[in-house]
Amino acid sequence: QSPIFGPQDVSSIEGNSVSITCYYPDTSVNRHTRKYWCRQGANGYCATLISSNGYLSKEYSGRASLINFPENSTFVINIAHLTQEDTGSYKCGLGTTNRGLFFDVSLEVSQVPEFPNDTHVYTKDIGRTVTIECRFKEGNAHSKKSLCKKRGEACEVVIDSTEYVDPSYKDRAILFMKGTSRDIFYVNISHLIPSDAGLYVCQAGEGPSADKNNADLQVLEPEPELLYKDLRSSVTFECDLGREVANDAKYLCRKNKETCDVIINTLGKRDPAFEGRILLTPRDDNGRFSVLITGLRKEDAGHYQCGAHSSGLPQEGWPVQAWQLFVNEESTIPNSRSVVKGVTGGSVAIVCPYNPKESSSLKYWCHWEADENGRCPVLVGTQALVQEGYEGRLALFDQPGSGAYTVILNQLTTQDSGFYWCLTDGDSRWRTTIELQVAEATKKPDLEVTPQNATAVIGETFTISCHYPCKFYSQEKYWCKWSNDGCHILPSHDEGARQSSVSCDQSSQIVSMTLNPVKKEDEGWYWCGVKEGQVYGETTAIYVAVEERTRGSPHINPTDANARAKDAPEEEAMESSVREDENKANLDPRLFADEREIQNAGDQAQENRASGNAGSAGGQSGSSK
């Protein structure tokens, strides 16, 4: 008894396709060993036609595939464009030779069945409309017209010209004539369902002089399109249901035995399991829409169907499109934190992975919003201005070549809680979803800046200090000036670094930054932060206002005076020039060329600029003390 199992007999018709699934015992060896499909010859030899090692025979070229699904302990052989020559005995099996574990499969391919000579074949998808054409002679022009469906020997009337309609075709079937045509009538059957399939006879007149036409109606369930995606990557279901449902509510559902559970629809329904990682986007006015799901999980694998109906729910007899999604657990996308926690007033540093082969791609960060069908407005990007409401507290740090970039958000409030997406204009699979949870702070922040009301006077010296705890002793401390295109590191002076780490004094760990002399363009947000190499940690932000010197005021900044008194003898100031070019970036149109749900931040580039952050800070200087 073979432990391999599959269909013993497969029968099909010329031109069709078959998908033969073979089941194997769930062992590590079986999952990884060679899978094959071979044809049994009269001499007992089984000639390989296709194998998981990449072999494909000439007669299967361009029409067959073998796919292993180790998570299901199955492999599938797909064979298209069948001919009668494909009839024969086959084996599906495992092992390095074709003598290993196998299962015998008999495949029989028949000719397309013959119908009565005058039979017209109509092939339609579920939910669509068929128009059956019925010809008749002039002698039956005024006779009764009808369409009936063959059931065994009987033919049950579907509709006739006396306005009779079979109850199962009520509101779906109409009989009509076009224009002045005297030799043809039509029957429309809409919202087709599988049981509508069969042989129909249309008739004009009665008895031997009646005109009859045969029609074979085939109602096809959608063949699922196979989608193979990596764990943690994203998938887009492109749904095109046609103009006739353009104004109906749209949905995507996941098949669960007989039912199809709605994941998202245009009426606002959304499955909680997809919260924060799904977007439904109308594509045009013809009923086209797409559904994007990010952060794919193992349990997302399965059968999906999109459809349209005024209820936003699956309804028999309405058009659908189908997919089978496979989620590959051997993913190239690294595992990153899906939940990041912060506290009010604090900060978070979120690491976003991207395809390392695309280090020059533009990087973005957007905030997923639940309203309507979900949307994700870009908050910051490598060439996108920071969105209004995020000035001074959000920056993106690219680390070319590292396969990741970091997004820092500080001055956190509970309103910042929610879902955020990392994305690039490159490989669309590398979209990651992060849930940010912001709780109320219960203690003072780790980084504190003094003075807290920072006003610098033009032409004078201004020093600002950042106090950090001993736990950050070994980390690199920095000050940076925030602008719409990032936070540019400034020279600073770490006063705690002179002490030995053993005798760390909690009160004297300070990194300070001096502006000397203060210029008008020095006004803006400054960040104090810690980092270890490329790994960014806590940050805090302060807004430095710059004002003209009032007549008669002393030429010394009190803060600066305190700093100098403490740190005599005076040291020479280090000058640095940090250029902040005017940011006129627009998002690369390729990024969301097919995904309008992610709002283009570049569109608002000119109006989003906060007045305090505009302009060039050409000759800004910072001195270290």
């Epitope: 099909s12 069709n16 078959v18 199955t74 599988p194 085939q218 369930e221 035995k257 007989e258 028999e316």
Partner: nanobody
Framework: EVQLVESGGGLVQPGGSLRLSCAAS????????MGWFRQAPGEEREFVSA???????????YYTDTVKGRFTISRDNAETTVHLQMNSLKPEDTAVYYC???????????????????WGQGTLVTVSS
């Protein structure tokens, strides 16, 4: 909802034949799987045979090893009925035979009870001399 009604069970001598039928009513599908399972007294229910079909006229027939070559599963095209022709019956074939249906087509393992949503009440087959 789909209702399944089995018929054709009865008493037969070893070596004899029986033809079981399973008629589906209610919602119908252009592609689904119908299977036969059996349960002998004091035993667990086990897979016997299944047939899957798709709207393009392709059929897949599955059998458990113990019935291969003796039992044949088929589908009546005009009706939504599945038949199990049982030849060369043995006393160990004695059981209640259940018909089951699923619309998952050719995707799930037809041997697994979990793949089937709808079940009939069962028909008793007794093979005895």
């Amino acid at each position: 909802e789909v209702q399944l009604v089995e018929s054709g069970g009865g008493l037969v001598q070893p070596g004899g034949s029986l033809r079981l039928s399973c008629a589906a009513s209610g919602r119908t599908f252009s592609s689904y799987t119908m299977g036969w399972f059996r349960q002998a007294p004091g035993e667990e229910r086990e897979f016997v045979s299944a047939i899957s079909w798709s709207s393009d006229g392709t059929y897949y027939k599955y059998y458990t090893d113990t019935v291969k070559g003796r039992f044949t599963i088929s589908r009546d095209n005009a009706e939504t009925t599945v038949h199990l022709q049982m030849n060369s019956l043995k006393p160990e074939d004695t059981a209640v035979y259940y018909c089951a249906a699923s619309s998952s087509g050719t995707y799930g393992d037809p041997r697994s009870e979990r793949e089937y949503r709808y079940w009939g009440q069962g028909t008793l087959v007794t093979v005895s001399s």
